[in-house]
Each structure stands twice: as structure tokens, then as C-alpha cells.
């Protein structure tokens, strides 16, 4: 039985041409985590291997800087970068976490960020 | 120049261990995951497991686990890999490949060990 | 364990033909798949990464596709060189595993 939730920044926004870390955190469970993937949409952006360390995808090497943690820095924002981005959490035993998190990148300098919410 | 150098052709009898081992040059070895494939004669490829140097951290396909270990020495540039309780069917090409920067796959590989388990 | 399913097995052709192989995965495997080319007695050399990225010193005839569950390699026209064993890895989670292999052979 799966027990864990996932925390994670919720809805996030940020300023072009700034950066943002997208985090989650897995808790309520026993389980390993034995990999997080970070994913948009179809595209994978970097995966983080309990014990292989990073692998960053070729078309996001510039702009993606591993950590901290199990996040992920994603700098030099553009308005594509506006999105859902997912934490996929490999977990043994338990299976597969997914957390959501949706960003903003906006225009202006305001740029407000969300609450924190939880995904059962 | 990178180069991935391994070490000889080894013959051994069912139930024995080999170990195997991959000398690099031309890269900081720390810096890159090292990777270990093996091919049976005339099969496909088939990953053994991957390991960090810089902090030890080991990946086993559970095919493997608990009879390959991996282990490397940071002072001269080697990585190793031992299997145990060989049996026939072990009987292969081994191989040791560098991961790519900051990525799984493997750019260079090391020009492959012939285990013959034959009793 | 994720399953790699290579077709064709074998595949006859001349010099100058444009050649396909492809690679289904048993599960999505976003674009974290690499091509591999392996000719006998020697060890195999990294062509494609991340499912489209040609690998330093690779030619330019060589390009690969693909994202989720169906990637192909393609060699627009094929050289007397490129006659070898191809292969197919995923490395989106551990165990990697490779396709069974495609070999390519002069007509």
C-alpha cells in the first residue's frame, strides 16, 4: 500500500530571464527512493539516480543545474518555460510518487509565489 | 586522449571468481560514472551495473547482484569488477564504459575481457 | 524491467541506401535512449544520445528519432563502413537495457 505524499511549491511564478528551483519532497513512507525524475509535459529534463548521480537531457544542459537536493535549478526563464512540471519519485517498495507543479514565468518584475500544497 | 584499458583473456572453472579490471587515462576519473556490459558470444549486450567513483555510489542490475561487485581505486584510475559463482552460461565478453558528463550513456569503452568458464 | 524490441532482427542492403531500424520500448521512456554500432570483435561505439543527439566525431548520416515508446536510427546513405550490428539502450531507469540487436548486412 502506498502511504507517501508528495509536497511540493505548487504554482510558482518567476521573472524572464531569471531562475527558479523546482522541489518536491516525498515523505509519510518508508520507501527507498531509488530515482526522481523531473519531467514537462513530453519532455524529459533531467533525471537524479540514488546512486548514479545526474543525468541532465542535451536540450536543457545550459539552462538546468542539478540540486539542491532532489531538485532541479532552471535558469535563464523564457515564457515557453511557462508549464507543468512533474517529480517523478521511483520509490521500492512502494512504486511511482508523481508531484505537480505548474510555472508562471512572467513579463513584469512581479512575480509572486504560490503555496505549498500536497499531492496524495 | 581518453583510453579505457582492460585486462586480459581469463579461463576458469565453474564455481570460481574473476575479477576484472579497467585502467583509465586522459580523464579525471572521478568525475565520470563507469559503466559494465557484458556479451555472451554471438548475443546482444547486457548491462552488469554502473558506479560513482566520486562518492561510491552503486547501481546493480538485480540479475547480478549479490555475485558482481564493483569497486574502483581512485589512486590509480582502476575500476573493477568481480563475478562469483561463475557457471557456463557467464561465459562472455565484459566490457567497462565510461557514462558521458552528467548523462547515462556510455562514450568510450574499454576493448572488452573474455571470460571462458569451462570446467 | 523495461523491454527493448529492435526490428528488423537482420537487414540486407547496398551501399547508398537509406536504412531504418527501430526501437519500441515496453514502457514510455521519454527521449532517454542511445544508439549503439558494434562490428565483430571490436566494442560498440556510442552513435546517438538522448534519442536525437549525434555523438562527437559521428557523420552526419546518421540521425535518430523518436520519443515515448518508438525511436528509429536512420543512415541516409549508407557507407561500406557502416556494416555492423546496431543497437538500441534506454537509460530512463535502471536496469538499463539494450534492444537485441539489428544486424546490417551488404546486399
Known amino acids: 500500500m502506498m502511504t507517501g505524499t508528495i509536497e511540493t511549491t505548487g504554482n510558482i511564478s518567476a521573472e524572464k530571464g531569471g531562475s527558479i528551483i523546482l522541489q518536491c519532497h516525498l515523505s509519510s513512507t518508508t520507501a527507498q527512493v531509488t530515482q526522481v525524475n523531473w519531467e514537462q509535459q513530453d519532455q524529459l529534463l533531467a533525471i537524479c539516480n540514488a546512486d548514479l548521480g545526474w543525468h541532465i537531457s542535451p536540450s536543457f544542459k545550459d539552462r538546468v543545474a542539478p540540486g539542491p537536493g532532489l531538485g532541479l535549478t532552471l535558469q535563464s526563464l523564457t515564457v515557453n518555460d511557462t508549464g507543468e512540471y512533474f517529480c517523478i519519485y521511483h520509490t521500492y517498495p512502494d512504486g511511482t510518487y508523481t508531484g505537480r507543479i505548474f510555472l508562471e514565468v512572467l513579463e513584469s518584475s512581479v512575480a509572486e509565489h504560490g503555496a505549498r500544497f500536497q499531492i496524495p | 586522449e581518453v583510453q579505457l584499458v582492460q585486462s586480459g583473456a581469463e579461463v576458469k572453472k565453474p564455481g570460481a571468481s574473476v575479477k576484472i579490471s579497467c585502467k583509465v587515462s586522459?580523464?579525471?576519473?572521478?568525475?565520470?560514472?563507469m559503466h559494465w556490459v557484458r556479451q555472451a558470444p554471438g548475443k546482444g549486450l547486457e548491462w552488469i551495473g554502473g558506479?560513482?567513483?566520486?562518492?561510491?555510489?552503486?547501481s546493480y542490475n538485480q540479475k547480478f547482484k549479490g555475485r558482481a561487485t564493483l569497486t574502483v581505486d581512485t589512486s590509480t584510475s582502476t575500476a573493477y569488477m568481480e563475478l562469483s559463482s561463475l557457471r557456463s552460461e557467464d561465459t562472455a565478453v565484459y566490457y567497462c564504459?565510461?557514462?558521458?558528463?552528467?548523462?547515462?550513456?556510455?562514450?568510450?569503452w574499454g576493448q572488452g575481457t573474455l571470460v571462458t568458464v569451462s570446467s | 524491467d523495461i523491454q527493448l524490441t529492435q526490428s528488423p532482427s537482420s537487414l540486407s542492403a547496398s551501399v547508398g541506401d537509406r536504412v531504418t531500424i527501430t526501437c519500441k520500448a515496453s514502457q514510455d521512456v521519454k527521449t532517454a535512449v542511445a544508439w549503439y554500432q558494434q562490428k565483430p570483435g571490436k566494442a560498440p561505439k556510442l552513435l546517438i544520445y538522448?534519442?536525437?543527439y549525434r555523438n562527437t566525431g559521428v557523420p552526419s548520416r546518421f540521425s535518430g528519432s523518436g520519443s515515448g515508446t518508438d525511436f528509429t536510427l536512420t543512415i541516409s546513405s549508407l557507407q561500406p563502413e557502416d556494416f555492423a550490428t546496431y543497437y538500441c539502450?534506454?537509460?530512463?531507469?535502471?536496469?538499463?537495457?539494450f534492444g537485441q540487436g539489428t544486424k546490417l548486412e551488404i546486399k
Open positions: 564504459a565510461r557514462g558521458a558528463y552528467y548523462r547515462y550513456d556510455a562514450d568510450y
Open positions: 539502450q534506454q537509460h530512463y531507469s535502471t536496469p538499463f537495457t
Open positions: 558506479l560513482k567513483p566520486d562518492n561510491g555510489g552503486i
Open positions: 586522459g580523464y579525471t576519473f572521478t568525475e565520470f560514472t
Open positions: 538522448s534519442a536525437s
